[in-house]
């Protein structure tokens, strides 16, 4: 998988007027890195782990750069012609990434009230737009507001290009975040369901990477996909990864179920514990 | 004594049917999740079906999906094997086998029938 | 779907030596493998299950190890009864069994 570093960026209107505040949200390898979400923005770390990859520093220069890019998203909102009474969103998504063999993307995508309308490749300058007469619209208006200003068009692209994968670079360089692997807490706990059924949930969690296999098994064999429930795979805000899958068994079988679970090649079961008492499985010996 | 017995093999032409049964004694059928396991003349065990104990999981091999069916009787202690569209090299000894329950297993089969033997001729 | 091959296909060995059965999993398999017997016109027995815990009832000469891709079944010292014919399942996902490795008389 690639490094990446998204920006998220919206700004609002309502009845027209483009509100003052904006949010910014970016992800660092997937994972909540730096979030603006007042008047004023202030960049602040989401957890220790980006604390840890941003070192003693202020963020007066992330904060900079995110109070510049949302003054000009809420530019571009203001030009937007399609504005209706009540709340409206434009969203802009920047994302860059570095790969294995060093090779870089970059891309820039705009969405109206969460429909997406306008995408670019930052390195190849190349415009797209979905077929829909409404995204075509919006897309020519934010496309003519953009060519307005010649210098905005060939040298903030560029830079924001470029930019984006220099501050990932940086960050890479802080070496918190290069290819670690974290193994997963794994517990399970049970449940009572109904007419002798109880419910077993198996939970992983303060995992990385994100890629994780988590099944139930009934003396060794997996259950059919169909007989468990699977929760997604979430950030849990600490720069890792939390999940779960559960399913159905008859009270008094418990000894028969375990939890397999398998990442980044080590591998664990995890039994149904006997009682009602919530049984925490450590880290793999 | 814990035993698993076969019946229902014989002699079908091609893109015939054949229903397999196995009848469980000694243990309670109810609670064990059971395959069915082939093995054609001269030739290796060939695993062909897997049900669980609430039949919520069934699984089959590729060389027989869409052609067979396993399906159980708890209360008449039997699993069954309903086998269609039939060709030559279903030509086999069919043995039901029990996964055994033990703790820490892996999907090992404890306890075998003794197998019936299937001919499809064409 | 897991491809189970077993090595040698067949072997000949006397009373008393130490045989060695391999069995390689196309994929990692943890340890989600068992090992059967089979004699002539009988049905398998189960010698192993989860790669190394005996089967209660089997004798202690008998013994697996492998995790991962690759397994071992071994013999420490062959009896006049252990001329049969031997196989590993996994169960990693679904099932399947290995091709088997007959083991007769030198």
């Known amino acids: 998988e690639p490094h990446s570093l998204r920006y998220n960026l919206t700004v609002l209107s309502w009845d027209g007027s483009v509100q003052s505040g904006f949010l910014t949200e970016v992800h660092l390898d997937g994972q909540p890195f730096l979030r603006c979400d007042r008047q004023k923005c202030r960049a602040k770390p989401q957890g220790q782990w980006a604390e840890d990859v941003l070192g003693n520093k202020t963020w007066d220069r992330e904060t900079r750069d995110l109070t510049g890019n949302g003054k000009d998203l809420r530019m571009t909102l203001a030009h937007i012609k399609d504005q209706k009474e009540g709340l409206h969103s434009l969203q802009e998504i920047r994302v860059c990434e570095i790969h294995e063999d060093n090779s870089t993307r970059s891309s820039q995508h705009f969405y109206y009230d969460g429909e997406l309308f306008l995408s670019q490749n930052l390195e190849t300058k190349e415009w797209t737009m979905p077929q829909s007469s409404r995204a075509q619209t919006l897309a020519m208006n934010v496309r003519n507001f953009l060519k307005e200003d010649a210098m905005k068009t060939k040298t903030h692209y560029h830079a924001m290009h470029a930019d984006c994968l220099q501050e990932l670079r940086r960050y890479l360089k802080s070496g918190v975040v290069l290819r670690r692997t974290v193994p997963p807490m794994v517990n399970v706990t049970r449940s009572e369901a109904s007419e002798g059924n109880i419910t077993v949930t198996c939970r992983a969690s303060g995992f990385y990477p994100w890629n994780i296999t988590l099944s139930w098994r009934q003396d060794g064999v997996s259950l059919s996909h169909d007989t468990q429930q699977w929760g997604d795979v979430l950030p849990d805000g600490n720069g890792t990864y939390q999940t779960w899958v559960a399913t159905r068994i008859c009270q008094g079988e418990e000894q028969r179920f375990t939890c397999y679970m398998e990442h980044s090649g080590n591998h664990s079961t995890h039994p149904v514990p006997s009682g009602k008492v919530l049984v925490l499985q450590s880290h793999w010996q | 004594e814990v035993q698993l017995v076969e019946s229902g093999g014989g002699l079908v032409q091609s893109g015939g049917s054949l229903r397999l049964s196995c009848v469980a004694s000694g243990f309670t059928l109810s609670r064990y999740s059971m395959n069915w396991v082939r093995q054609a003349p001269g030739k290796g065990l060939e695993w062909i079906s897997y049900?669980?104990?609430?039949?919520?999981?069934?699984y089959y091999a590729d060389s027989v999906k869409g052609r067979f069916t396993i399906s159980r009787d708890n209360a008449k202690k039997s699993l069954y094997l309903q086998m269609n569209s039939l060709r030559d090299e279903d030509t086999a000894v069919y043995y039901c086998?029990?996964?055994?329950?033990?703790?820490?297993?892996?999907?090992?089969?404890?306890?075998w029938g003794q197998g019936t033997m299937v001919t499809v001729s064409s | 779907d897991i491809q189970m091959t077993q090595s040698p296909s067949s072997l000949s060995a006397s009373v008393g030596d130490r045989v060695t059965i391999t069995c390689r999993a196309s994929q990692s398999i943890s340890s989600y493998l068992n090992w059967y017997q089979q004699k002539p016109g009988k049905a398998p027995k189960l010698l192993i299950y989860a790669a190394s815990s005996l089967q209660s009832g089997v004798p202690s000469r008998f013994s697996g190890s492998g995790s991962g891709t690759d397994f071992t079944l071994t013999i420490s010292s062959l009896q006049p009864e252990d001329f049969a014919t031997y196989y590993c399942q996994q169960s990693y996902s679904t099932l399947t069994f290995g091709g088997g490795t007959k083991v007769d008389i030198k």
């Open positions: 086998a029990r996964v055994s329950d033990i703790t820490g297993n892996t999907g090992a089969f404890d306890i």
């Open positions: 049900i669980n104990s609430r039949s919520n999981t069934i």
